[in-house]
Interface confidence: low
């Protein structure tokens, strides 16, 4: 059946606003919020650049990668004690994400 | 309820091109992982590739520069660049869904009734 | 290349007996399997994701299991209805080497 609107598809999530702070030198964060509808196991996470319902164990084990968090094409690495995650694209440019 | 249905099955002669189309009701193409599969009468199913929301693509290694997927906003096409007799098939396109586990672990939650398409002199 | 073996080939089997369909991966797949239901003139339908999931709708008699490279589809006290050929995929996508997916050779089930 049709979803009603602003209803969200088991496992899925949307963007519902986006910004960006250039305040710091040097540096662009960017925040998304997302909303998401995730199945029993599943948290809301990071696939594809894409907030995206991923399993819960990737959370707890803070093994980043494994949610596919980089464009397609580039290299993901966890940094140092696993705070977040590294994307390295072709070209060798490295975008850094940390979880707070 | 969400569906897919493929068109573009015919006979062709071999060497002809043939591009094969998938539209999809219930669910925006655009945002899925989408995937060809084929089935020769009588046998089994064979992967053919998949396409990302980005438009990039893998294939199998069998498939490699014999199969073009690509996409528009409303399709997901199938172009056999060289038709032979082998590739006399039932084509069908599916929707890949996944969950994240050690990777993307990939399956295929809707699929058309396929399009027929015989390469034949 | 990813390999999947599924075995047996086909089989026959009464109603209400217990069927196991198994596939072997030639490398570890880490759960990247699903398993597929398919009749004459119709595509497949999804029965098991990820070894152990039942697709929404899927009847509670098929489960799947396994770990490894190493994986089996049950149908625990078959049907009439469950007379079909059955298929494994296999494969996992990672960001470094994109998506590799196999099928096994299926398995034709007959009920006698």
């Known amino acids: 059946q049709f979803l009603k609107e602003g209803q969200l598809a088991a496992g899925t999530c949307e963007v519902i606003a986006a910004h960006r702070d250039s305040s710091q030198p040097r540096r662009t964060i960017a925040r998304q919020t997302a909303r998401c509808a995730c199945r029993k196991g599943q948290i809301a996470g990071t696939t594809r650049a894409r907030p995206a319902c991923v399993d819960a164990r990737i959370i707890k084990t803070k093994q980043w990668c494994d949610m596919l968090p980089c464009l397609e094409g580039e290299g993901c690495d966890l940094l140092i004690n696993r705070s977040g995650w590294t994307c390295t694209q072709p070209g060798g440019r490295i975008k850094t994400t940390t979880v707070s | 309820q969400e569906q897919l249905v493929e068109s573009g099955g015919r006979l062709v002669t071999p060497g002809t091109p043939l591009t094969l189309s998938c539209t999809a009701s219930g669910f925006f193409l655009s945002g899925y992982y989408m995937s060809w599969v084929r089935q020769a009468p009588g046998k089994g199913l064979e992967w053919i590739g998949i396409i990302y929301p980005s438009g990039s693509t893998d294939y199998a290694s069998w498939a490699k520069g014999r199969f073009t997927i690509s996409k528009t906003s409303t399709t997901v096409d199938l172009k056999i660049t060289t038709p032979t007799t082998e590739d006399t098939a039932t084509y069908f396109c599916?929707?890949?869904?996944?969950?994240?586990?050690?990777?993307?672990?990939?399956?295929?939650?809707?699929w058309g009734p396929g399009t027929l398409v015989t390469v034949s002199l | 290349e990813l390999v999947m073996t599924q075995t047996p080939p086909s089989l026959s089997a009464s109603v209400g007996e217990t069927v196991r369909i198994r596939c072997l991966a030639s490398e570890d797949i880490y759960s990247g399997i699903s398993w597929y239901q398919q009749k004459p003139g119709k595509p497949p339908t999804l029965l098991i994701y990820g070894a152990s999931n039942l697709e929404s709708g899927v009847p509670p008699r098929f489960s799947g299991s396994g770990s490894g490279s190493d994986y089996t589809l049950t149908i625990g006290g078959v049907q009439a209805e469950d007379a079909a050929t059955y298929y494994c995929l296999g494969g996992v996508t990672y960001s470094s080497t994109g998506t590799h997916l196999t099928f096994g050779a299926g398995t034709n089930v007959e009920i006698k």
């Open positions: 599916a929707r890949v869904a996944g969950y994240v586990g050690y990777g993307y672990e990939t399956f295929f939650d809707i």
